[in-house]
Amino acid sequence: EVEKTACPSGKKAREIDESLIFYKKWELEACVDAALLATQMDRVNAIPFTYEQLDVLKHKLDELYPQGYPESVIQHLGYLFLKMSPEDIRKWNVTSLETLKALLEVNKGHEMSPQVATLIDRFVKGRGQLDKDTLDTLTAFYPGYLCSLSPEELSSVPPSSIWAVRPQDLDTCDPRQLDVLYPKARLAFQNMNGSEYFVKIQSFLGGAPTEDLKALSQQNVSMDLATFMKLRTDAVLPLTVAEVQKLLGPHVEGLKAEERHRPVRDWILRQRQDDLDTLGLGLQGGIPNGYLVLDLSMQEALS
């Protein structure tokens, strides 16, 4: 707590300006009117106040707004935002995307601070869902934001928001997260034509089922090996050699380099060696000619 002392004659602040950096803490407390500070918050950021001086300014705002700051003040907090505690932020009602952006800018390039984590939580809960503009903003500052949500949380993301997702935003997602995001992406991009659709859906294909991969194989998409290697093993296994050849197009030659890795390894084991030989890549490990293939999973389902 800063002691209440009278403001020395002639030192009463008429506006928030550089002269205040020479004020002692007690002088700031005594000579700066909280209401003036609130209306001129946008100036605080341009003035090189010390951390101690910022503490005093925060204290003044806390006294003026014990129930939480109004958004007009929050939007201009700048570096004073880093002085806020999560408890302070929980009192706020931030509804403007511009306010969110302004505060995220303060922390840009750094790991998420407790303040930012609380702010984002409050903002998203206030909106009710992760809409496109919010997701766009969050991933601009935190590219891994989407992949930091659980599959359950991702299920409440509306398909329209998927338009805001860039390939790098999915880099750290695990297969279960992609399982949830893929159907949303499929719905979001359904009205696009073949080649445009493939460009957009490509990053999400780690969640695609077999039927969709079969459909893509009919569209001359020329999937690259990096994308193929991220597909679900269970979705790749039922594909025929002809379908994989069509799916990969000129990239099919890359299968040789990946023959020991999933899902290629497991897929090879399911194919007839005769069929594999038609690729002319020297892939080995397929089912020898004359062997009968029993689908045990089908047998179990029937019994």
């Epitope: 998420m112 930012v116 891994g144 992949c147 949500l149 659980s150 750290t172």
Partner: nanobody, 115 residues
Framework: QVQLVESGGGLVQAGGSLRLSCAAS????????MRWYRQAQGKQREWVAS???????SYSDPVQGRFTISRDNARNTVYLQMNSLRPADTAVYYC?????????WGQGTQVTVSS
């Protein structure tokens, strides 16, 4: 800066169990996803399991029902309980911490399952 240190690997007979630990040091806030990956000799690194900020979990098909991921927030540690181990589970197991901005990796711990 976040650092991750795995432990608990070793040699075990097929059918046996192991419990891997991953201790995180350094501060991170916001949503955190802890994941285990593994990499067998000459193979690509593959995802094993995840535990999300909400506490919910998910597993890859090969380990579903045999492995359990859990965490102790007080100790900043995530665990992977591995039961009914198979020779195919032999690999270096890596711990990964994903935040909204970064992805951090541990050095890995070797798990060998003999038949």
């Amino acid at each position: 800066q976040v650092q991750l240190v795995e432990s608990g690997g070793g040699l075990v007979q097929a059918g046996g169990s192991l419990r891997l630990s991953c201790a995180a040091s350094g501060s991170t806030f916001g949503r955190i996803v802890m994941r285990w990956y593994r990499q067998a000799q000459g193979k690509q690194r593959e995802w094993v399991a995840s535990i999300y900020d909400s506490g919910s979990t998910s597993y890859s098909d090969p380990v579903q029902g045999r492995f359990t991921i859990s965490r102790d927030n007080a100790r900043n540690t995530v665990y992977l309980q591995m039961n009914s181990l198979r020779p195919a589970d032999t690999a270096v197991y890596y711990c990964n911490l994903g935040t909204a901005l970064s992805s951090y990796w541990g050095q890995g711990t070797q798990v060998t399952v003999s038949s």
